[in-house]
């Protein structure tokens, strides 16, 4: 019979012969032949390999360095790499989060609309009219003026995105 | 075809060295372990060593030290660098394809440790 | 070092006897052995590998079992070409290393 140009899913051609692959979590020893099939080794302790695969060495797990704020999210196994993420009030800088940075906190004036994870950074926004903040904080959304009528106040000062209002008593010398 | 064939064997003296070699056809040693294992005269099979693809190697407790097994992938050879050899090292010395599926294997060469 | 215990070491049977020859391993190694059969003067042949399987071209009434630290190869009904001496062959999972049993000769009762 001709020699195979081409092999099914999970194997591959290698001397004009089709053979399986490496299943995850294995890397190659030795090729098939006509009489034997594919020989695979499992990954050592800290390996792995996530793909059907013709690998001669498996991949280190990543390590999660704690001196750059890491730690680990996620176990790896012999199929799956080590997940990473940062320490509490920290974040990734990248995806694949190879470093942390602190988080982020709000400048008065800024309330935190989304609040950061060990992944994503702060998110700020700008306190609208009606609202405020008057701390730098990575936690504090703005908060509304405090409302004088209710109170039975009156605006002595008029608040800004980093002040509340200030209220008064009511001027009781009206005609 | 598949083939290996090992040379480097001969008459050689207590404490001496001798290193064989294993040339290999047939097949890429880019992705194949090869083993290196012993017969002495009218005894059982011994395994020496390995050496994977990846290019780390293996020995058997005795063997450490003493021999190492290195490779040249241009030339598609292996190496058995033998060190300090014994009497007790005389022995038909095979190598083979695999770990623990060795189907291929050469026909050996004797080494001989006498004075 | 892996041990890998072989018995018996000889065997004295007859054309058509059913023999075995089992194998012990010092520590468990999953299925990672493998059978050989050897005739003076020559290499060993590849009869069983991963325990159970044979290599295609070997005749069927070689059969191999077992898994952890104890096998058994069964020749079914030996033929005068099976007079030969045989050895299992196990090894560590992580690659670290074989050994090979004492072998085991099958010789003509």
């Known amino acids: 019979p001709e020699p195979p140009t081409a092999c099914r899913e999970k194997q591959y051609l290698i001397n004009s012969q089709c053979c399986s692959l490496c299943q995850p979590g294995q890397k190659l020893v030795s090729d098939c032949t006509e009489f034997t099939e594919t020989e695979c080794l499992p990954c050592g302790e800290s390996e792995f390999l996530d793909t059907w695969n013709r690998e001669t060495h498996c991949h280190q797990h990543k390590y999660c360095d704690p001196n750059l704020g890491l730690r680990v999210q996620q176990k790896g196994t012999s199929e799956t790499d080590t997940i990473c993420t940062c320490e509490e009030g920290w974040h990734c800088t990248s995806e694949a989060c190879e470093s942390c940075v602190l988080h982020r906190s709000c400048s008065p004036g800024f309330g935190v609309k989304q609040i950061a994870t060990g992944v994503s950074d702060t998110i700020c926004e700008p306190c609208p009219v009606g609202f405020f903040s008057n701390v730098s904080s990575a936690f504090e959304k703005c908060h509304p003026w405090t409302s004088c009528e209710t109170k039975d106040l009156v605006v002595q000062q008029a608040g800004t995105n980093k002040t509340d209002v200030v209220c008064g008593p009511q001027d009781r010398l009206r005609a | 075809e598949v083939q290996l064939v090992e040379s480097g064997g001969g008459l050689v003296q207590p404490g001496g060295s001798l290193r064989l070699s294993c040339a290999a056809s047939g097949f890429s040693l880019s992705s194949n372990a090869i083993s290196w294992v012993r017969q002495a005269p009218g005894k059982g099979l011994e395994w020496v060593g390995i050496i994977y693809a990846s290019g780390d190697t293996y020995y058997a407790s005795w063997a450490k030290g003493r021999f190492t097994i290195s490779r040249d992938n241009s030339k598609n050879t292996l190496y058995l660098q033998m060190n300090s050899l014994r009497a007790e090292d005389t022995a038909v010395y095979y190598c083979?394809?695999?770990?623990?599926?060795?189907?291929?294997w050469g026909q050996g060469t004797l080494v001989t440790v006498s004075s | 070092d892996i041990q890998m215990t072989q018995s018996p070491s000889s065997v004295s049977a007859s054309v058509g006897d059913r023999v075995t020859i089992t194998c012990q391993a010092s520590e468990s190694i999953s299925t990672r052995l493998a059978w050989y059969q050897q005739k003076p003067g020559k290499a060993p042949k590849l009869l069983i590998y991963?325990?159970?399987t044979l290599p295609s071209g070997v005749p069927s009434r070689f059969s191999g079992s077992g898994s952890g630290t104890d096998f058994t190869l069964t020749i079914s009904s030996l033929q005068p070409e099976d007079f030969a001496t045989y050895y299992c062959?196990?090894?560590?999972?992580?690659?670290?290393?074989?050994?090979f049993g004492g072998g085991t000769k099958v010789e003509i009762k």
């Open positions: 083979a394809r695999g770990y623990t599926t060795l189907y291929f």
């Open positions: 991963s325990a159970s």
């Open positions: 062959q196990g090894g560590y999972s992580s690659g670290a290393g074989t050994a």
